[in-house]
């Protein structure tokens, strides 16, 4: 015997209180598939969350984050604070990258400068808090006196994190 609820389309629910009639989802709720016995409550984008897409009877609302924050997690389940380039977010707030590390984005962690010498290359442009070093040709490729080779910067040592 076919379940009468299977005929209820998305945007409705099978109302047991009304002889399994397909009733439209109430305001601020939705059903994204047919045959549902209840409608789900729409997500509310509150606080730092902003509405990217309004809830409809067949699909949930979608949120993003207010300026100065970015989404984390599936479906933007969290908002995380942006920092400036050259910083990383810690539990003490935004902190400058330690010497020898950089971050060229407003999110994420500071990463160690590239160690050019590991590839047998020299440092062409020194690194900063915001930019990685630029490696140049290997010292053997340089004619004598053509360039001064900067020693590679140390990678971040344990305990030097701003946390």
């Amino acid at each position: 015997l076919q379940d009468p609820c299977s005929n209820c389309p998305a945007g409705t629910f099978c109302d047991n209180n009304r002889n399994q009639i397909c009733s439209p989802c109430p305001p601020n709720s939705f059903s994204s598939a047919g045959g549902q016995r209840t409608c789900d409550i729409c997500r509310q984008c509150k606080g730092v969350f902003r509405t990217r897409k309004e809830c409809s009877s067949t699909s949930n609302a979608e949120c993003d984050c207010t300026p100065g924050f970015h989404c984390l997690g599936a479906g933007c389940s969290m908002c995380e604070q942006d920092c400036k380039q050259g910083q990383e977010l810690t539990k003490k707030g935004c902190k400058d990258c330690c010497f020898g590390t950089f971050n060229d984005q407003k999110r994420g962690i500071c990463r160690p400068w590239t160690n050019c010498s590991l590839d047998g290359k020299s440092v062409l442009v020194n690194g900063t808090k915001e930019r990685d070093v630029v490696c140049g040709p290997s010292p053997a490729d340089l004619s004598p006196g053509a360039s001064s080779v900067t020693p590679p910067a140390p990678a971040r040592e344990p305990g030097h994190s701003p946390q």
């Epitope: 606080g47 730092v48 984390l72 997690g73 389940s77 969290m78 908002c79 995380e80 977010l89 539990k91």
Partner: nanobody
Framework: EVQLVESGGGLVKPGGSLRLSCAAS????????MIWYRQAPGEELEWVAN????????YYVDSVKGRFTISRDNATNSLFLQMNSLRAEDTAVYYC????????????????WGQGTTVTVSS
Amino acid sequence: EVQLVESGGGLVKPGGSLRLSCAASGFTFSNYWMIWYRQAPGEELEWVANINQDGSEKYYVDSVKGRFTISRDNATNSLFLQMNSLRAEDTAVYYCARGGDGYSNSHYGMDVWGQGTTVTVSS
């Protein structure tokens, strides 16, 4: 329903004090980091302070250090912000927020926010 409700804002003269409260419900309050943010008129949200689950770790933005104190009472599911020596530049809407699962471990994301309480510092 997971909810945060702030209270305690108001109009205060420079040099005055206010104590903001944030009542949490619908989740196990003691399992989460909690955070205060503020938004001055026309400005982006600014992190003010945060506190870990048992209150043993507290951090503040430089501009409020020595003047503001964050605290919590896990028995009553409450977060507080004691604000002393208030200045005109502290005028803002203050929000409490819940740190998401993994806060201070894998990320610093917030997943629940209150509606905010307005603090106005003016003579």
